[in-house]
Interface confidence: low
């Protein structure tokens, strides 16, 4: 029996398709949404239990350039007293987000995509204890 | 755009900047980390400021499964595991970029996309504002 | 080169169970995500279920969540699909597929094995 054909526009390549090289894609790095912006509440790194710092990496040969990355300030947790609670832990939360890396080789460029993981904020959580026998 | 340092024997047709359009391996540096934040972490479950998980999927966007994370209270978990309402749990979010087929459909021509995603939940003490 | 043999199709009663496997050959199995698609009788191709290199991810079609089960043995180099409470409009030829690097574009596809529901 002949494989099939695929019917449905799911899998399908269309004609109008833009010719690429094997093993490569195109890619076009003007960002769809460029002008969308983070609508995230006042100040929540520093109202939070579990506070965190920014600090940009900076990347001339990565594109986005500017990455922000973030850094729990503490160990434990702040209370209701404003004292750090070592018996919580702040801990951080990660997102993965691709960027594109420029490499030269001699006069040569070329492109990867990469994806990095980028530290977004911080969370309080109960430990998980291990009881040793 | 962004200037780059160019060794000064090249030819001078390298663009300093990123061009609009590039021709990009197929293969993705760090493709194999984990991205089901179910598998990787339990923070979900045992934050003060919980959350759950919902699942995103668009085939003409890589990666085409994101996850999106839904505070579960208003207030925060406290020591004897209820709600309190003194405190607020709100979401994190992040900006991140994608790959959207562009043509749609087209299996190796994409274009950069920019989106917002909730990624967890944190406990803040509220913004308390006193009418006069 | 590269090859895919799927196994294990045949006729069941609706309610019932069967278990597909896919032995691949050719190439690095634990570098992509494999698929499984249908094509029912004089009907076009359906997504199924894919699953990721590493194992730590499955999609499933909304027709067949709950119901179905995609799994991989990167060692054996095989996948496989546990179809439970199966029903007439289940009844196909199920191919499994390999992935682009990039999903849901096939560049290899198995001979294929029929699955007949009915009572």
């Known amino acids: 029996r002949k494989i099939p054909k695929v019917g449905h526009t799911f899998f399908q390549k269309p004609e109008s398709c833009p010719p690429v090289p094997g093993g490569s894609m195109k890619l076009d790095i003007g960002i769809i949404n460029e002008n969308q912006r983070v609508s995230m509440s006042r100040n929540i790194e520093s109202r939070s239990t579990s506070p965190w710092n920014y600090t940009v990496t900076w990347d001339p040969n990565r594109y986005p350039s500017e990455v922000v990355q973030a850094q729990c300030r503490n160990l434990g947790c702040i209370n209701a007293q404003g004292k750090e609670d070592i018996s919580m832990n702040s801990v951080p939360i990660q997102q993965e987000t691709l960027v594109v890396r420029r490499k030269h080789q001699g006069c040569s460029v070329s492109f990867q995509l990469e994806k990095v993981l980028v530290t977004v904020g911080c969370t309080c959580v109960t430990p998980v204890i291990h009881h040793v026998q | 755009g962004i200037t780059i340092p160019r060794n000064p024997g090249c030819p001078n047709s390298e663009d300093k900047n990123f061009p609009r359009t590039v021709m990009v391996n197929l293969n993705i540096h760090n493709r194999n980390t984990n991205t089901n934040p179910k598998r990787s972490s339990d923070y979900y479950n045992r934050s003060t400021s919980p959350w759950n998980l919902h699942r995103n999927e668009d085939p003409e966007r890589y990666p085409s499964v994101i996850w999106e994370a839904k505070c579960r209270h208003l207030g925060c978990i406290n020591a004897d595991g209820n709600v309190d309402y003194h405190m607020n749990s709100v979401p994190i979010q992040q900006e991140i970029l994608v790959l959207r087929r562009e043509p749609p459909h087209c299996p190796n021509s994409f274009r950069l996309e920019k989106i917002l995603v909730s990624v967890g939940c944190t406990c803040v003490t509220p913004i308390v504002h006193h009418v006069a | 080169e590269v090859q895919l043999v799927e196994s294990g199709g045949g006729l069941v009663q609706p309610g019932g169970s069967l278990r597909l496997s896919c032995a691949a050959s050719?190439?690095?199995?634990?570098?992509?995500?494999m698929y499984w698609v249908r094509q029912a009788p004089g009907k076009g191709l359906e997504w199924v279920a894919k699953?990721?290199?590493?194992?730590?991810?499955?999609y499933y079609a909304d027709s067949v969540k709950g119901r179905f089960t995609i799994s991989r043995d990167n060692a054996k180099k095989s996948l496989y699909l546990q179809m439970n409470s199966l029903r007439a409009e289940d009844t196909a030829v199920y191919y499994c597929?390999?992935?682009?690097?990039?999903?849901?574009?096939?560049?290899?596809w198995g001979q294929g094995t029929l699955v007949t529901v009915s009572s």
């Open positions: 050719g190439f690095t199995f634990s570098s992509y995500g």
């Open positions: 699953i990721e290199q590493d194992g730590s991810e499955e």
């Open positions: 597929a390999k992935g682009e690097i990039l999903p849901l574009y096939f560049d290899y």
